[in-house]
């Protein structure tokens, strides 16, 4: 049945990086406003984003309890104004959203390199490890904490004075890699969950080039 | 007339639950939304919970998140607020309102029901 | 959360002079799809629950006398009391819902000087 004056949201849509995660919908409110509702398949139905005007809803906090449940959330469509004044007091409008696992489909967000060393024809590249919005004990976990050895991580690298890109990987958060002496070389990595079917791969991050102030030179 | 009728409140110790009730009159009340509303004693307003006119939709403020649930039964025009685990600083007036012309604008407000948490 | 800051704490005023409030908001509550703002002032007596005096900033309630005016956009606003009566005296609050939670002002509290 539904509300007078009100239209069902839809195009839900998740858009999630690192576990920060947002619901977004159409269409823009023209005498409606929303009422999101997020639950797991076996749990009950929270409210957030209560009478919103937004077209969209922030639902991390919900789903950082335990990314990988499975989740679905739906959307409400209320007259903007009492129900009295504005129509007959149905059924609201909603409409489901898709189902969405944290972990399974966050993106990986672009990862830093956070430094690099070179020891004699050795270079040290090290990947920042990432917070996250997951908590356990009341500290937040970085991405290998939530991934584990899921994470993996590409590096690719070549000399400055050449295209040819080789490739390097680990799961961990540290590359170690053998270099021609006096060469320069730049860098660029990937996060990868080899694992997954869908988004399984981050964007590259910014390159970094030896010479520039991330790295540290030292002869041996 | 609209009238709202707060009852339930009480001297409860610390830990203990209560159940507030607003019976409404005068107005079709499936048709609202409804909130309680506190004022601890000499204290300004605290808003601590809304439920949708369909009773689907229910939202808390922080601070009773997890202990205090809305509820409503349209076939007998009341709004209820049960209180769990209650705290010294839930000592408050409660009342119930009425959505107004918009969603959290009060146009009707009961004459409060007084909770004292004290051991 | 949007934060609610009135000012001054208590106001004292004669008899038929003018009485201002003001509130201010954390953040705007003003949508901008319709232009209102998402703004209320009730007023509180001793012993009894609040009354709807103005929302949407600036429209008065049915019922109330026009000597109430409210007036402001964005993140500050003033309820504005013309000509003082001693019925007036009460506790003043203003509240956004423009967002949930909804919150309150800490109030204003006016009386005869």
């Known amino acids: 049945s539904g509300t007078t004056n009100t239209v069902a949201a839809y195009n839900l849509t998740w858009k999630s990086t690192n576990f920060k995660t947002i619901l977004e919908w159409e269409p823009k409110p023209v005498n409606q406003v929303y009422t999101v509702q997020i639950s797991t398949k076996s749990g009950d139905w929270k409210s957030k984003c209560f009478y919103t005007t937004d077209t969209e809803c922030d639902l991390t906090d919900e789903i950082v309890k335990d990314v990988k449940q499975t989740y679905l959330a739906r959307v409400f469509s209320y007259p903007a104004g009492n129900v009295e004044s504005t129509g007959s007091a149905g059924e609201p409008l909603y409409e489901n959203s898709p189902e969405f696992t944290p972990y399974l489909e966050t993106n990986l967000g672009q990862p830093t390199i956070q430094s690099f060393e070179q020891v004699g024809t050795k270079v040290n590249v090290t990947v920042e490890d990432e917070r996250t919005l997951v908590r356990r004990n009341n500290t937040f976990l970085s991405l290998r904490d939530v991934f584990g050895k899921d994470l993996i991580y590409t590096l690719y690298y070549w000399k400055s004075s050449s295209s040819g890109k080789k490739t390097a990987k680990t799961n961990t958060n540290e590359f170690l890699i053998d270099v021609d002496k006096g060469e320069n070389y730049c860098f660029s990595v990937q996060a990868v969950i080899p694992s997954r079917t869908v988004n399984r791969k981050s964007t590259d991050s910014p390159v970094e080039c030896m010479g520039q102030e991330k790295g540290e030179f030292r002869e041996i | 007339q609209v009238q709202l009728v707060e009852s339930g409140g009480g001297v409860v110790q610390p830990g203990r639950s209560l159940r507030l009730s607003c019976a409404a009159s005068?107005?079709?009340?499936?048709?609202?939304?409804m909130h309680w509303v506190r004022q601890a004693p000499g204290k300004g307003l605290e808003w601590v919970a809304v439920?949708?006119?369909?009773?689907?939709?229910?939202y808390y403020a922080d601070s009773v998140e997890g202990r205090f649930t809305i509820s409503r039964d349209n076939s007998k025009n009341t709004l209820y607020l049960q209180m769990n685990s209650l705290r010294a600083e839930d000592t408050a007036v409660y009342y119930c309102?009425?959505?107004?012309?918009?969603?959290?604008?009060?146009?009707?407000w009961g004459q409060g029901t007084l909770v004292t948490v004290s051991s | 959360d949007i934060v609610m800051t009135q000012s001054p704490d208590s106001l004292a005023v004669s008899l038929g002079e003018r009485a201002t409030i003001n509130c201010k908001s954390s953040?705007?509550?003003?949508?901008?799809?319709?232009?209102?703002?998402?703004l209320a002032w009730y007023q509180q007596k001793p012993g009894q629950p609040p009354k709807l005096l103005i929302y949407?900033?600036?429209t008065r309630e049915s019922g109330v006398p026009d000597r109430f005016s409210g007036s402001g956009s964005g993140t500050d606003f003033t309820l504005t009391i013309s000509s003082l009566q001693a019925e007036d005296v009460a506790v003043y609050y203003c509240?956004?819902?423009?967002?949930?939670?909804?919150?309150f002002g800490g109030g204003t509290k006016v009386e005869i000087k």
């Open positions: 309102a009425r959505d107004g012309v918009y969603y959290g604008v009060y146009d009707y």
């Open positions: 005068g107005f079709t009340f499936r048709s609202y939304g």
């Open positions: 439920i949708t006119y369909d009773g689907i939709n229910k």
């Open positions: 953040q705007s509550v003003l949508f901008s799809s319709n232009n209102k703002n998402y």
């Open positions: 949407w900033a600036s």
């Open positions: 509240q956004q819902f423009h967002s949930y939670p909804l919150t």
